[in-house]
């Protein structure tokens, strides 16, 4: 009884198509597959950023796989051939591993790379990224931002930089068609007359960095002798009502402060007849049904009621 063996895949490599972190892992079938013509060979692929605790594992019949990586770190991957038990009259047969690594050949000392990179997708409409120059760079250093997401043919450079003292310190992006709910890749690199500049890579999803506009049209309505309903309207723009959470801050007679988080555009407040003044502000954030994270909007303008009797009044700012 001869032991069944299979070779690992050939020409296993990680290919960088220039998409700032979205890489192709590709390979060729193993040598000497002739004995297994009737078999569907599978491949088990494992890959990770170097330093990561866990491997991502994929089993596929294809000769390629694509995924996103952090190019600030190296990448390692390994693959072996799997012969299913149907092909071997018994147990599954695995080849030895073929291994490969990839990393951007880095340049520059750490004091040259950008600091405090911050990106905000304002009102789910306008993306703006800003950064500080590296601690050790001179005014002759300029930074360039490139970005890519699935749907673009190639990485694009920022065309509208924000500048300070002649240096690029941010980017206003153009309209980004069909760019949410997918990885958005950014590279900030640079040039200087006297030293190489360290590149930095960033990946995020746009829906997770949305900062909405504040709510508008804040109103009061007396519901009963001891209840007031606070109402407001969703911020203007493309974000649907179902995507909002709100935080309210209510101040009664300059003393009691009530804060609450609600999912719709109303809040009912218990009051006493002694209430002389009532003020409230609201802010909005994209909720867990539409994103994994988000940024609170600025507070709305304050809406206040002052007076003797609220029983017959609806107050509209």
């Amino acid at each position: 009884d001869t032991e069944i063996k299979v070779n690992p895949p050939q020409d296993f490599e990680i290919v960088d198509p220039g998409y700032l972190g979205y890489l192709y892992l590709q390979w060729q079938p193993p040598l000497s597959l002739d004995h297994f013509k009737e078999c569907t060979v599978e491949y088990e692929l494992k890959y990770r950023n170097i330093g990561s605790e866990t491997w991502k594992t994929i089993i596929t019949k294809n000769l390629h796989y694509k995924d996103g990586f952090d190019l600030n770190k190296g990448i390692e991957a390994k693959i072996h051939t799997l012969l299913p038990w149907q092909c071997t009259n018994g147990s599954e047969v695995q080849s030895s591993w073929a291994e490969t690594t990839y990393w951007i050949s880095p340049q520059g000392i750490p004091e040259t790379k950008v600091q405090d990179m911050d990106c905000v997708y304002y009102n789910w409409q306008y993306l703006l990224c800003s950064w500080k120059p590296g601690i050790g760079v001179l005014l002759d250093t300029n930074y360039n931002l490139f970005y890519w997401y699935e749907g673009l043919d190639h990485a694009l450079q920022c065309v509208d930089y924000i500048k300070a003292d002649g240096q690029n310190i941010g980017c206003r992006f153009p309209y980004l068609e069909a760019s949410d709910y997918k990885d958005f890749y950014i590279c900030v690199n640079g040039s200087s007359e006297n030293k190489p500049i360290r590149s930095s890579y960033f990946t995020f999803q746009l829906q997770n960095i949305v900062k909405p506009l504040p709510p508008v049209y804040l109103t009061f309505t007396r519901e009963s002798s001891c209840e007031i309903k606070l109402k407001w309207s969703i911020p203007l723009g493309p974000i649907p009502a179902r995507c909002f959470d709100y935080e309210i801050e209510i101040r009664e007679d300059d003393t009691t402060l009530v804060t609450a988080t609600v999912e719709n555009e109303t809040y009912t407040l218990k009051t006493t007849n002694e209430t002389r003044q009532l003020c409230f502000v609201v802010r909005s954030k994209v909720n867990i049904y539409c994103s994994d994270d988000g940024i609170w909007s600025e507070w709305s303008d304050k809406q206040c009621w002052e007076g003797e009797d609220l029983s017959k009044k609806t107050l509209l700012r």
């Epitope: 000392i109 750490p110 004091e111 601690i135 050790g136 001179l138 006297n194």
Partner: antibody, heavy 118, light 107 residues
Framework: QVQLQQSGPEVVKPGASVKMSCKTS????????MHWVKQTHGRSLEWIGI????????NYNQKFKGRATMTVDKSSSTAYMQLRSLTSDDTAVYYC???????????WGQGTTVTVSS | DIQMTQSPSSLYASVGDRVTITCKAS??????LSWYQQKPGKAPKTLIY???RLVDGVPSRFSGSGSGQDYTLTISSLQYEDMGIYYC?????????FGAGTKVEIK
């Protein structure tokens, strides 16, 4: 040629402060950052922080943040480091060091010995 | 912070011996590693940068290798003047961190 000349030894009491200097020559002071490194018992080396003489920007090792202050005087091409609230653990040799465009460190001062003793 | 584990802490070798010192980083430092030699009462002197690039004027018996987390300094044929303490330094990110040093002594 490039030189980094550090101030002389200091003996100070616990709780006091010390300010040491690093006078540079042989290159344009504002074209390179300056780093400070602590060496204890002639063995262990610790990076304290970096200052950009061009704009005064700094980055401190968290361990020294709040107690170390790095400054520069562009007119005399001199870097300074002040250490406050000294304890016996601060007894060490302190070096200023300059990087090259591609690596750390191209040039070192001769070191300032600080002894904290009551 | 990135930790640098250097070994051995000291070694005795004869003139002409091949000497190897290793540094292991707690994470991938992408070859951002320098090696220094320090003699008593003197400031450290850079021998190697970017893991394997020899500084001008440093004898060719010194060489560096490694990538990822593991790095090595080799002295191919130890000379009397090579006595001293050797340190590695990672400069992938702030704060910069040094190895604890290897004291090289001649038998």
């Amino acid at each position: 040629q490039v030189q980094l000349q550090q101030s002389g030894p200091e003996v100070v009491k616990p709780g006091a402060s010390v300010k040491m200097s690093c006078k540079t020559s042989g290159y344009t002071f504002t074209e390179y950052t300056m780093h400070w490194v602590k060496q204890t018992h002639g063995r262990s080396l610790e990076w304290i922080g970096i200052i950009n003489p061009n704009n005064g920007g700094t980055n401190y090792n968290q361990k020294f943040k709040g107690r170390a202050t790095m400054t520069v005087d562009k007119s005399s091409s001199t870097a300074y480091m002040q250490l406050r609230s000294l304890t016996s653990d601060d007894t060490a040799v302190y070096y200023c060091a300059r990087p090259s465009a591609t690596h750390y460190f191209d040039y070192w001062g001769q070191g300032t010995t600080v002894t904290v003793s009551s | 912070d990135i930790q640098m584990t250097q070994s051995p802490s000291s070694l005795y070798a004869s003139v002409g011996d091949r000497v190897t010192i290793t540094c292991k980083a707690s994470q991938d430092i992408k070859s951002y590693l320098s090696w220094y030699q320090q003699k008593p009462g003197k400031a450290p002197k850079t021998l190697i940068y970017r893991a394997n690039r020899l500084v001008d004027g440093v004898p060719s018996r010194f060489s560096g290798s490694g990538s990822g987390q593991d790095y090595t300094l080799t002295i191919s044929s130890l000379q009397y003047e090579d006595m001293g303490i050797y340190y590695c330094l990672q400069y992938d990110e702030f704060p910069l961190t040094f190895g604890a040093g290897t004291k090289v002594e001649i038998k």
